[in-house]
Structure formats: C-alpha cells, structure tokens
Amino acid sequence: EPYTDSNVPEGDSVPEAHWTKLQHSLDTALRRARSAPTAPIAARVTGQTRNITVDPRLFKKRRLHSPRVLFSTQPPPTSSDTLDLDFQAHGTIPFNRTHRSKRSSTHPVFHMGEFSVCDSVSVWVGDKTTATDIKGKEVTVLAEVNINNSVFRQYFFETKCRASNPVESGCRGIDSKHWNSYCTTTHTFVKALTTDEKQAAWRFIRIDTACVCVLSRKATRRG
C-alpha cells in the first residue's frame, strides 16, 4: 500500500454490511452493465459533461484505496458526522455513510512548551483536475462521476507546508550552528479515478501528505 498516513484522519474498520449509497449505486450500475455492457455511465470531467465509460467493476477491487481519497455526493463529512474517514473492511474508499465511529487524534496535540518542527495545513481538495501519476505522466483527474443520477465528487485530503522556514534559520528547534534546515512538502501516491479521452481508470496519483524538515550538515572549517 503506497501511502503514508501522516495527518490522515483515521477511522475504525467497519463491517462490510455498512455499504455506502455509492456502493449500492455501483452495484445497481453493475447489474445493468451486465445486461447492457455497452451502456456508458456519464462522467463529468472538470465541469464538462462527457460520456465516459466508467465500468462499475472499477469500484469492486477495493484493496488499494487510501483514506485520503473520498467519493461523496456532499462535501467531505466532518468529524461529528464521520470525518473519521471511516473506511470499510480492508481499508476501502471512505465513502459517505451514516455509520459513526470513534475518531482518533489526527495530528499531534502539542502541550505547553511543545512545538512542531515544521508547520502544516491540511484541506480537503475538491478542485483537482490534473495530477502527476506514478510514472510521472500528467493525467486528468475525474472530478465528478454521475452514477444513476447521483453526482459523486472525488476529494483528496492533502497536507502541505505553511512555510519553508518557520523560523529565520529554517526548521524550528534545529541547531543552526551545525545544521542547514528547511521544511518541505512530501508526497505519496494514492489510487484515484482518472480518465483519458475515452476511458476512466484507477491510477496512482501524487498528492501532498506531510511537511517534514530536511537537514544537511554545515561544512565544518578546519583550522
């Protein structure tokens, strides 16, 4: 599974019975696709409505989905109504559901006198239209999928640095006498629904996932 969970809102694994509205829609679509395999499912790409064939079977292989990717008819749920990003058994796509589960702490809680070395900001990104895939190729991200007249949006939970230098010398709390430092956004790859001209497919795309401190030792002078 090629993703880190730095800063990811966590959720408890829940029984298969807790299927989402999307899963039901997909099951219905899948049954229809079996009887009429050529019927395309309309998908809207970057706001333009086009007929793109989305095989509902794409949603059946749920092994590789990250809790950082969400398909939902509404904006991402909040923790009070499931921003635990609850994912189903085997860590499937965290679709919107009515199931509620405990939410664990999503990023370090700093106590008095404790500081973060680098400062990050996290948001649900719903305006992703292009991305870089795992092969370094620019791909089009399927922003919305229309299934059985329900429009599902693809959201990504992304974390990036707020500043490359939280303090003048670089990262916070680093001995600047001996070390050069700066904060940088690191990435991971998550499975996302993407499209080329005709076909929708799952691809690993790169998203921002953490803000880390990069250190390099300062050259020491020899007298």
């Epitope: 800063n7 809207r44 970057t46 706001g47 333009q48 904006p75 991402p76 909040t78 923790s79 009070s80 921003l83 999503t106 990023h107 400062d119 990050s120 900001v121 996290s122 948001v123 649900w124 990104v125 719903g126 305006d127 992703k128 239209t129 922003a143 919305e144 949006r153 959201y155 992304e158 974390t159 707020r162």
Partner: antibody, heavy 122, light 107 residues
Framework: QVQLKESGPGLVQPSQTLSLTCTVS????????VNWVRQATGRGLEWMGG???????DYNSALKSRLTITRDTSKSQVFLKMHSLQSEDTATYYC????????????????WGQGTTVTVSA | DIQMTQSPASLSASLGETVTIECRAS??????LAWYQQKPGKSPQLLIY???TLHTGVPSRFSGSGSGTQYSLKINSLQSEDVASYFC?????????FGGGTKLELK
Amino acid sequence: QVQLKESGPGLVQPSQTLSLTCTVSGFSLTNNNVNWVRQATGRGLEWMGGVWAGGATDYNSALKSRLTITRDTSKSQVFLKMHSLQSEDTATYYCARDGGYSSSTLYAMDAWGQGTTVTVSA
Amino acid sequence: DIQMTQSPASLSASLGETVTIECRASEDIYNALAWYQQKPGKSPQLLIYNTDTLHTGVPSRFSGSGSGTQYSLKINSLQSEDVASYFCQHYFHYPRTFGGGTKLELK
C-alpha cells in the same frame, strides 16, 4: 490587476428571483474559484456558495434549494440566481476569489468585489 | 457544517494596546483558517491565511496563531486605522463558514 465587480438590481420584490453577475478581470476563472458571500446590514458574513475552477459548484446547505451558481468563462462572468426571496435576504452581496489548492493562499478569499446592495421589499 | 465561534463580539481598546480575538471551530480544521478585516462601508480584506501567514501588504503588528480547534488573531500596538470588524473563516472543506465577527472600537 485582479478585480471583481458585482452587478444586479438594487430592489427585488418578495417571492421573486434575484439575478446577480460578477465580472472579473486580471485572473482566469479556469484557474481560480469564485465564491458568493452576503452580509445583512450590521451582521456577519455568510458564505453562499462557489464555483470551482473546474466548473463544479458547492452551496451553503441552508440556501441550496433556492440557489444556482453558473459561469461563462469566455465572458469572465459568474452568475448567482436565487429564487423565492424574502425580506431576510436583504443584504450586500459580494463575489470573492480564492486561488484554489495550488495557490499559496489556498482557499482563503484574497480578492473581493465592492459588493452590491439588494433590498427585498414590495 | 463546521461552526466557527468568535469572541468577543465587540471590544474597546486604546491606541498602542495589544488586542486578541479568539476563534473556536466546532472541530479540527487543520490550520485551514483565514482572518479578514472589514472597515465600515468597505469590502472585507484578507489579513491572514493558513492560520499565521500574513497576506501581502498586511502590517507586521498583525499575527495569527493556533491549531486544532482554537485560533487567535493578535494586534500589537493598536493603530487608529485598525478600527474595523474582524472575521475568521475556515476553508478545511465546503461549506466555508465564518465566525460571527468582532467589532473593534477605540476607547
């Protein structure tokens, strides 16, 4: 430079439909998100909805049933339509830009129009 | 929806004083918070984004801080031109919501 300008009728009859236009310059609608925010006299700011750079829309759930936001990228215009207006919809209506995830300011609204005042009254 | 609770609703301060305005989110917003200043009869203007980053042209007497659900805006050495209403707003996800605002006046 970046500019947004709201236009529309100053007076709307109760139960009628409000149509506002936000004309933008200095940036592209296909690279930025545009939001509508309103403010009743002496009150706070209320986010109404917005259109993403990609063309998708999101709405304030309390207004969703009466609100439609569209755009015409070739004219650099964003439109707000709200039906069944009542006196409590009397407010100054602003359009505001946010640069989206790829901008340094993320989704903070970094440029605002001057606002247009709408009165709902018979 | 995430609720943003701002306090105080109004405050009076003297020139040169330090003023702090608080904003509490109903849940974690991961530092996706902005502060706006609105002078009487004018449009709101972005002051601070990403919790603590000053927008272009904003004087350094303004600063933002916080994390999780608790955020604050601090104005050091209050100037007469700082008389305005201040609003916090989250952009963690849609729908965006604003705090109720704080009206800052001079004593």
